[in-house]
């Protein structure tokens, strides 16, 4: 990536890392308002299976692994990107490496959920406090999960689907920070590992993923009021290990693997019309990206 200063524009969709033939160090940003892509400063270490989030206007890249011709190393790293300076800086590492991690943000704290270190599939969860640059373990999930989708709604943290080391999962659970405890919620209609999970209009969406047999294009959403999962329109492409985020009331899914091809496709979901549309292509196909949107 280029090392010049990034333009000072708001509300960009950032995509970090990913995998195509090997783990990638790309950081690129898509501007939905004009359809352009920016090439930004590379990650200091290539990684796939990472997660991205934004706290205080800074982009964080969490976990993943560096799968390269030289070897395969799971990552405990937390790195922080400042859009104003177009520079990455390392933060305190997590307590354990976490590949295919999920993350969520509550009250400015980053929760790192599940993931794997070698053949160890974590149920552990830890919370990062940016102001102290410290991680602390919180209550573990009830289930081991890698390829887990994580979302935050009403200050509750949801962990959805994934792989426990033996089976792909349709189960989901919810973390209550005040009680420091997890509770199971209604299972999805579909087994999904490596799905894209996000929150839009008081619902949790789970898009795509892998059911242990095939990649999926189906999408379902969880209504916290009725505690039910309902299918919405399917994506145009089957995909697992995709990136997902919400921008101005629409869901964006980025890349992923369809069982044969590493997708460059970016689709956008409009909840008002219950339709998906192809909006752009990434500069190259990849799976296992970390995605987040800058705050206003």
């Amino acid at each position: 990536g280029s090392m010049g200063h990034a333009p000072k524009v708001g509300r960009l969709i950032y995509t970090a890392g990913g995998y195509f033939r090997q783990s990638l160090s790309y950081l690129e940003a898509y501007n939905p308002s004009d359809g352009t892509w920016l090439d930004l400063a590379d990650l200091q270490v290539p990684r796939s299976g990472l997660a991205g989030c934004v706290v205080g206007g800074l982009l964080y890249a969490v976990g993943g692994r560096n799968n390269s011709p030289d070897g395969n190393t799971d990552s405990s790293a937390l790195d922080c990107y400042n859009p104003m300076t177009n520079q990455w800086s390392p933060c305190a590492p997590m307590s354990v490496p976490r590949n295919r991690i999920g993350v969520g943000v509550i009250d400015g704290h980053i929760y790192a959920v599940g993931g794997s270190h070698g053949c160890i599939h974590h149920n552990s969860v830890e919370r990062y406090e940016p102001e102290r640059d410290e991680w602390h373990l919180v209550a573990p999930m009830l289930t081991r999960r890698i390829g887990v989708g994580v979302a935050v709604l009403n200050r509750l943290l949801y962990a959805v689907g994934g792989f426990d080391g033996t089976n792909r999962l349709n189960s989901a659970e919810c973390y209550y920070p005040e009680r420091n405890e997890w509770r199971m919620i209604t299972a999805m209609n579909t087994i999904r590992s490596g799905a894209g999970v996000c929150v839009l209009h008081n619902c949790i969406y789970a898009a795509g993923g892998y059911d242990g047999q095939d990649q999926l294009n189906s999408v379902e959403r969880y209504d916290v009021e009725t505690e039910t999962w309902t299918f919405v329109a399917p994506m145009k492409h089957r995909r697992s290990a995709l990136g997902i985020t919400v921008h101005q009331g629409r869901i964006y899914v980025l890349g992923g693997y369809d069982g044969h091809t590493f997708l460059d496709s970016v689709e956008c979901y409009d909840p008002d019309t219950d339709t998906w549309s192809e909006v752009t292509r990434m500069t190259s196909g990849r799976s296992g990206v970390g995605v987040a949107v800058t705050m206003e």
Partner: antibody, heavy 121, light 107 residues
């Protein structure tokens, strides 16, 4: 019957290329991690490469990284091992295997019959 | 890479004998060890996974155990069809590695 059948082996000169195929029947390769393992004449087993059906990520032994490429075509229910820049020390019987997942660990529970690759001038 | 040191490299035994083969990992591999049987000109067959779990269809005379980084395959009463080469494999850490094999021959 669950079965894997390899093909594509043969005699090739050093520096040459071969593509091995592994045709699956009785199960979908989209549902399994597929591995290649080789065995040099009179020697033990050596893991070579694997492909993850969920993420598409591939892993390689250092001895073949950058020269071999594993791939899968789910529409043909077949996995492949593209071998370039072959060396004499790549001479071996090549097996493809289906990996069984348990407790996060993959074990090869179904093996093909193997195909012999001989690298010699 | 994790080394799997298998012993003995060969052994002679009679039908009905109790046979023990050992594999020592160079570092912790938890219980992520499998055992395979291979006959000449044939592909390996999975016998034991997760150090001590018997794979489906494998006779109960085969068993596996773990003590720290030492792993043992035991054949309680050797049968004529058990004369073969046996390999251990660790899948705990990348790259997966095999022991060098133990050939079980007829005495």
């Amino acid at each position: 019957e669950v079965q894997l059948v390899e093909s594509g082996g043969g005699l090739v000169q050093p520096g040459g290329s071969l593509r091995l195929s592994c045709a699956a029947s009785g199960f979908a390769i989209s549902a399994s991690s597929i591995h290649w393992v080789r065995q040099a004449p009179g020697k033990g087993l050596e893991w070579v490469a694997s492909i993850d059906p969920e993420t598409g990520e591939t892993l390689y032994a250092k001895s073949v990284a950058g020269r071999f490429t594993i791939s899968a075509d789910t529409s043909k229910n077949t996995a492949y091992l593209q071998m370039n820049s072959l060396r004499a020390e790549d001479t071996a019987v090549y097996y493809c295997a289906r990996a069984y997942a348990g407790d996060g660990v993959y074990y090869a529970d179904v093996w093909g019959q193997g195909t012999l690759v001989t690298v010699s001038s | 890479d994790i080394q799997m040191t298998q012993s003995p490299s060969s052994l002679s035994a009679s039908v009905g004998d109790r046979v023990t083969i050992t594999c020592r990992a160079s570092q912790s591999v938890s219980s992520a060890v499998a055992w395979y049987q291979q006959k000449p000109g044939k592909a390996p067959k999975l016998l034991i996974y997760s150090a001590s779990s018997l794979y489906s269809g494998v006779p109960s005379r085969f068993s596996g155990s773990r003590s720290g980084t030492d792993f043992t395959l035991t054949i309680s009463s050797l049968q004529p069809e058990d004369f073969a080469t046996y390999y251990c494999q660790q899948s705990y850490s990348f790259p997966s590695t095999f022991g060098q094999g133990t050939k079980v021959e007829i005495k």
